[in-house]
Amino acid sequence: DWVVAPISVPENGKGPFPQRLNQLKSNKDRDTKIFYSITGPGADSPPEGVFAVEKETGWLLLNKPLDREEIAKYELFGHAVSENGASVEDPMNISIIVTDQNDHKPKFTQDTFRGSVLEGVLPGTSVMQVTATDEDDAIYTYNGVVAYSIHSQEPKDPHDLMFTIHRSTGTISVISSGLDREKVPEYTLTIQATDMDGDGSTTTAVAVVEILDANDNAPMFDPQKYEAHVPENAVGHEVQRLTVTDLDAPNSPAWRATYLIMGGDDGDHFTITTHPESNQGILTTRKGLDFEAKNQHTLYVEVTNEAPFVLKLPTSTATIVVHVEDVNEAPVFVPPSKVVEVQEGIPTGEPVCVYTAEDPDKENQKISYRILRDPAGWLAMDPDSGQVTAVGTLDREDEQFVRNNIYEVMVLAMDNGSPPTTGTGTLLLTLIDVNDHGPVPEPRQITICNQSPVRQVLNITDKDLSPHTSPFQAQLTDDSDIYWTAEVNEEGDTVVLSLKKFLKQDTYDVHLSLSDHGNKEQLTVIRATVCDCHGHVETCPGPWKGG
């Protein structure tokens, strides 16, 4: 029959070439002379001339060694023609299968593979995957089947079997729980890929495994005991820098320290922060310390990390003995602001009050006093006793120096320390009103017509406070009542002045006496301009000129 079974030819054959493979034969050769030919890639089309056929015998020839990795299968057509060139058979399919030889070594896809794994993990944890390829056949043979293995591990600490590799997938995993970044931060594995499923050619590469940091080391104080000296009253004062060591990766959350004052800071006087570069704990005063109240503080500070510990670790504690240094403190007036009620107008030399300061220092220091600010110069202060006396007339109605009945004075106390310190106090004198002002009318100049005059309403003011004010009483004196009348309104806070007899145009003095509820009398002269006019007028008209 005009058929041929698939032909298997091993690659890399050593010849001699041409090498006879198989004979094409048509049974029509009994009747006529047959000529054989082949076509297809590898015969008459690229790659041309790999195969040929003996024209008259039909022997299929291989002209050179084959490479399966280049072409694994050739599909040719065999032809049979008679002498006259007529086709005697249908073209026949010829399959030539190139069988594999193990002529390629495995090749890793990288010279160096890099992976990482957290320290302290248990066996079974995947690290990385390595890959090697082999051009040989891995379907019908083991030539291209790669088996992975670890050839060596550096360093060999804590032992030489820290990792394993899946022989088929190339996945590297941990097989020991002894990974400790602080001892071995990186392992270098020499890995092998061997074809023939582990029995053939071998190639090597490197797998570098970085051991990642876990917070498995607690920060430790070094030293654990500190002594510090701090002046009293200093706020924000750096007391001490606390130093810790931590074996975890520098500048990582597992290394960065977090400090906590665990005890000894009952009054919340201290605070502690972490220095961003040195990782030291900076202990500072949050409030001023008081030597007189407590001259020594023993603080207990605990240190942990920003990151939580991955296991139960003992925390380190430091002890800081803080010695408070005595400072000459300023005297403090008690109270800092003193309110004293005093009558205005008291006689000169009259005592106002005693205003003294206390010295926080334990020594019996002498305190001397003086007035620092006394705007009106009304007061004096005894330097030894702090006695304040009047040396001027205290005037409640003095608008330049008195606001809302209060006269403000600043006093100073100075101790005899070395150097001396001073403290100030504020003395607020609430001046009690005395009926020392009589009522005054406003305005004190009026203009009025001498015919059908309009009544003039004058407001009454009194600088004193109630009850030394309204109701007011009015009385005309010095014969002013001949031409004028003065009446206080119902509310008692205005006086109405009326012209009751004709006066020629001129300026007149009206003598008006006003008295307040406390009978304090004040005589005021009202300047009245009388004009020749009727009713209401503001200024006197000029002389009449006829036309």
Epitope: L122, G124, H166, I175, S176, S177, G178, A214
Partner: antibody, heavy 117, light 111 residues
Framework: EVQLLESGGGLVQPGGSLRLSCAAS????????MSWVRQAPGKGLEWVSA????????YYADSVKGRFTISRDNSKNTLYLQMNSLRAEDTAVYYC??????????WGQGTMVTVSS | QSALTQPASVSGSPGQSITISCTGT?????????VSWYQQHPGKAPKLILS???KRPSGVSNRFSGSKSGNTASLSISGLQAEDEADYYC???????????FGGGTKLTVL
């Protein structure tokens, strides 16, 4: 001499709790991962849980996950297994074993846990 | 159902040799050379007798040997003795959080 000594077993009602301890001696305890393995009466060995030498990494069998907690105190050379929500099927001898890479050695003598009402 | 398959029982006469198989998959026994064998006498704790397929800890008789082919590991005991009568368990490493797979155990009877 390398020794592991389990304690804390006993009879407990379903839903109850027990805490097993394993005291280690004769080796550097903190350098070893440790494991609990159990054996139900007449049955084979079943791995229960493991913990790394530092205590930072733990594994559990699916059958005990969420109910059992493995821990260790390296300062006391002691391994623990806190067992909560116990079931009848947790009845077994519980062995504590050192994990030398990926094999169990040494083993303790075991402690019996019976879960029954 | 154990992850690794072992015969339930094997037996042999004193002086004979026996083999216990332990069959897994290409992801455990077949993938790694980390098969271990344990011997357990009745009422006693298990004891490691082989690690890494064929490595004997000190103090273990050289009558115990191990091998592996494909996905199956084997424990061989030569010159059987009465004290070898025990349960034998295999374990294999597997790359996951259940990193230890146990076989169901094999009861060895010395006739």
């Amino acid at each position: 001499e390398v020794q592991l000594l389990e304690s804390g077993g006993g009879l407990v009602q379903p839903g109850g709790s027990l805490r097993l301890s394993c005291a280690a001696s004769g080796f550097t305890f903190s350098s070893y991962a440790m494991s609990w393995v159990r054996q139900a009466p007449g049955k084979g060995l079943e791995w229960v849980s493991a913990i790394s030498g530092s205590g930072g990494s733990t594994y559990y069998a699916d059958s005990v996950k969420g109910r059992f907690t493995i821990s260790r105190d390296n300062s006391k050379n002691t391994l623990y297994l806190q067992m909560n929500s116990l079931r009848a099927e947790d009845t077994a001898v519980y062995y504590c074993a050192g994990l030398d890479r990926v094999w169990f050695d040494p083993w303790g003598q075991g402690t019996m846990v019976t879960v029954s009402s | 159902q154990s992850a690794l398959t072992q015969p339930a029982s094997v037996s042999g006469s004193p002086g004979q040799s026996i083999t216990i198989s332990c069959t897994g998959t290409s992801n455990d026994v077949g993938a790694y050379n980390y098969v271990s064998w344990y011997q357990q006498h009745p009422g006693k704790a298990p004891k490691l007798i082989l690690s890494e397929v064929n490595k004997r800890p000190s103090g273990v008789s050289n009558r115990f040997s191990g091998s592996k082919s494909g996905n199956t590991a084997s424990l061989s005991i030569s010159g059987l003795q009465a004290e070898d009568e025990a349960d034998y368990y295999c374990t294999s490493y597997r790359m996951d959080s259940t990193f230890m797979l146990f076989g169901g155990g094999t009861k060895l009877t010395v006739l």
